[in-house]
């Protein structure tokens, strides 16, 4: 029998290599059964995750999953960092793994690195 717990499908130590100035959607895939939980995004500041208020968010529904999306319009260099989504379900808080945005500031990059280069060497990116 399938579990009816809320589950948040963000991979541990996942990351996204993105460019300042581009639009970007950060997705939090949510599995639930009857009632969609309230979901929020926060940004890690050390060990504290600071709730993101007043940001453009939306839901996208697919067959087996819903996606709670945080919109970056556009990405700023200051968006670099780690993010986590949380679901409020039956008075309990379910937290996702954090996912990291590595933002390359195109103004300071002489040319856009290739996706392969960024993927294998995220530590070279804007930090």
């Amino acid at each position: 029998k399938e579990s009816c717990d809320v589950q948040l499908y963000i991979k541990r130590q996942s990351y996204h290599s993105i460019f300042a100035g581009d639009p970007f959607k950060l997705e939090c895939p949510v599995k639930y059964c009857a009632h969609r939980p309230q979901v929020t995004w926060c940004k890690l500041n050390g060990t504290t995750c600071v709730k993101l208020e007043g940001r453009h968010t939306s839901w996208k529904q697919e067959k087996n999953l819903s996606f709670f999306i945080l919109h970056f319009e556009p990405v700023l260099p200051s968006d670099n960092g780690s993010y986590r989504c949380s679901a409020n379900f039956l008075s309990a808080i379910i937290e996702s793994h954090s996912t990291t945005l590595y933002v390359t500031d195109v103004k300071s990059a002489s040319e856009r690195p290739s996706k392969d280069e960024m993927a294998s060497r995220p530590w070279l990116l804007y930090s």
Epitope: Y9, K11, R12, K115, A119
Partner: antibody, heavy 119, light 112 residues
Framework: EVQLQQSGAELVKPGASVKLSCTAS????????MYWVKQRPEQGLEWIGR????????RYDPKFQDKATVTADTSSNTAHLQLSSLTSEDTAVYYC????????????WGAGTTVTVSS | DVVMTQAPLTLSVTIGQPASISCKSS???????????LNWLLQRPGQSPKRLIY???KLDSGVPDRFTGSGSGTDFTLKISRVEAEDLGVYYC?????????FGGGTKLEIK
Amino acid sequence: EVQLQQSGAELVKPGASVKLSCTASGVNIKDTYMYWVKQRPEQGLEWIGRIDPANGYTRYDPKFQDKATVTADTSSNTAHLQLSSLTSEDTAVYYCAVNDGYFEYFDVWGAGTTVTVSS
Amino acid sequence: DVVMTQAPLTLSVTIGQPASISCKSSQSLLDSDGKPYLNWLLQRPGQSPKRLIYLVSKLDSGVPDRFTGSGSGTDFTLKISRVEAEDLGVYYCWQDTHFPRTFGGGTKLEIK
């Protein structure tokens, strides 16, 4: 049940390249991390690198950065390890492994592929 | 790189007796979620490694409860309460927190 099927043994000449494959069943590899581990004869285990098949992003041990390239083909549920400029030091068993990227539910290893580098 | 140090190198145990293997990491294995990603593997002779324990103390499905993982910080232990013949092989600890991932050197469990 999650299972991995690795390609067969390889005998290759020094300086050549080889590409190993690892096909998963019982899971969509987009929901996993796939990684490769080297074991030289009668030695311990060395982590080479991993891929997130959902986006192709890779991480390597720096000592394998110029030797190994890990790729994934989600259409065939397969990961690949390419090894270049082979020397006798590359003679080893290469294991692919897969783990659940979300909840640590599974961590499964393939049977290994033996690569022998000899002229 | 995180150095994983296992002891002893070889363990010779009589069937039915307990066994204990130590694994020390050169730094904390806590990830950003506050959990320690420390695994134990068993490689039986002629076979590929198989995960026994993850997150320090959680047993993989099908692993007998005579196996116990414990520890915190940088010191971890795998215990077998009563060794059976099928337990022989090489045990490895490895950390799945820091890049690059690293393995202990292995402990060979022999049956006396």
